[in-house]
């Protein structure tokens, strides 16, 4: 019995259906086929879980969290024992193993391994101003999304005809910050942060209004 090499990893957007491949060749009829799909979750590598099982012509459910979401892609028994997972959750991310036995066929590689990564688009980021908005001050524009896998990058732009940040601004696209030193009246305006990753983007807006000092009355 020989389980075919799998493509290594599968990526899917949260809520979509993942198909985890596993196929094998065997010299024996599929009369005594049994298959166990296991997962080693990324969130808890010490706690492997059963996903779905096939034994003696019957299907058996695995862990509670997979109930109603998992099945074999084809009619069993078959040499293609790939499974689907519907409505994928972040917690489904992990290393999946298919363990195949088909007695009397022994020997060979009877385990297939496939990684599953559930991708999450960035959630609506929060835009904030840190520091005084008085003329000549330094301010930091902050942007961060609570969710996003892979981790989002953040791009700030000023919503004027140039879309360029002020010349005194420095941007950190990983941290989502823009530091604007020595703010002037030209620094005022609407700023947009775009959080993006491999599967989506999300934005927030921030209105920076530089406060000019009040002229002293004599």
């Amino acid at each position: 019995l020989e389980v075919s090499e799998s493509p290594g990893s599968v990526q899917v957007a949260r809520g979509q259906t993942a198909v985890l491949p596993c196929a094998f060749s065997t010299s024996a009829a599929l009369l005594n086929l049994n298959v166990i799909w296991m997962v080693i979750p990324l969130s808890n590598a010490n706690q492997p879980e059963q996903v779905i099982l096939y034994q003696g012509g019957q299907m058996f459910d695995g862990a509670l969290r997979f109930h109603g979401r998992v099945g074999f892609t084809g009619t069993m028994p078959a040499t293609n024992v790939s499974i689907f997972i519907n409505n994928t959750q972040l917690s489904d991310t992990g290393t999946y193993q298919c363990l195949v036995n088909n007695l009397p066929d022994r020997g060979g590689r009877n385990i297939g391994v496939t990684g599953l990564t559930v991708l999450v688009p960035p959630s609506a980021p929060q835009c904030q101003i840190q520091g005084s908005q008085d003329l000549g001050s330094d301010v930091i524009l902050l942007c961060s999304s609570e969710e996003g896998i892979p981790r989002p990058t953040y791009l700030w732009e000023k919503l004027d005809n140039t879309l360029k940040l002020p010349p005194t601004a420095t941007q950190d696209q990983v941290q989502g910050t823009v530091t604007i030193r020595n703010i002037s009246a030209l620094s005022s305006g609407l700023y947009q942060c775009v959080a993006s990753n491999a599967i989506g983007t999300s934005t927030c807006l921030l209105d920076l209004q530089v406060i000019s000092p009040q002229p002293r009355s004599v």
Epitope: N32, N34, Q55, G56, Q58, F60, D61, L64, H67
Partner: antibody
Framework: EVQLVESGGGLVKPGGSLRLSCAAS????????MNWVRQAPGKGLEWVSS????????YYADSVKGRFTISRDNAKNSLYLQMNSLRAEDTAVYYC?????????????????WGQGTMVTVSS | AIRLTQSPSSLSASVGDRVTISCRAS??????LNWYQQKPGKAPKLLIY???RLQTGVPSRFSGSGSETDYTLTISSLQPEDFATYYC?????????FGHGTKVEIK
Amino acid sequence: EVQLVESGGGLVKPGGSLRLSCAASGFTFSSYSMNWVRQAPGKGLEWVSSISSSSSYIYYADSVKGRFTISRDNAKNSLYLQMNSLRAEDTAVYYCVRSIIVQALGITSVFDIWGQGTMVTVSS
Amino acid sequence: AIRLTQSPSSLSASVGDRVTISCRASQIISNHLNWYQQKPGKAPKLLIYAASRLQTGVPSRFSGSGSETDYTLTISSLQPEDFATYYCQQSYSNPRTFGHGTKVEIK
């Protein structure tokens, strides 16, 4: 203590219906496949039906297919068998039985916990 | 469906005797064979699974053996509480099937 308690048996006329219930306690019911197995008076054991823990997979013996319906309510820790179009040959003690998967020969399944049974008599 | 033929259908034995019960399958079942004990008016109880593995709590005088189509349940030294009916059952394929039983009676 792990326990399965059947109820709902009784005397019914041919062509009639009956609903058996099984109350489970002492284990996480929602994690196990469950079965009904019957035994006619003075006879051997006959598997009737199986249902997987999520109710996704259901199996019946040919002798009851189309007449019996197995179901479960995990919130109530209960297993059911709706029996319609009953025949004299359905007369038996009906057992509620838990299945477990054990790691042996790869994997195999076993009827490890049995209820005390409920008697169903089909007679005119 | 796989047929399981048990023999003998009944036997008489004395306390301390060695008892063997046979179960033959109509096709190879690759050790997917379980044994149950049933006392009158009671539910069956699992003794042996996967042909030879002793269920937790079952006395070690019970043992199982066999392969392919032929399987045996052995009670090495029969005790008074062992007088009962014994059933084999296959979990190799659907439908799950049982043998017709072997009744062990007091001689």
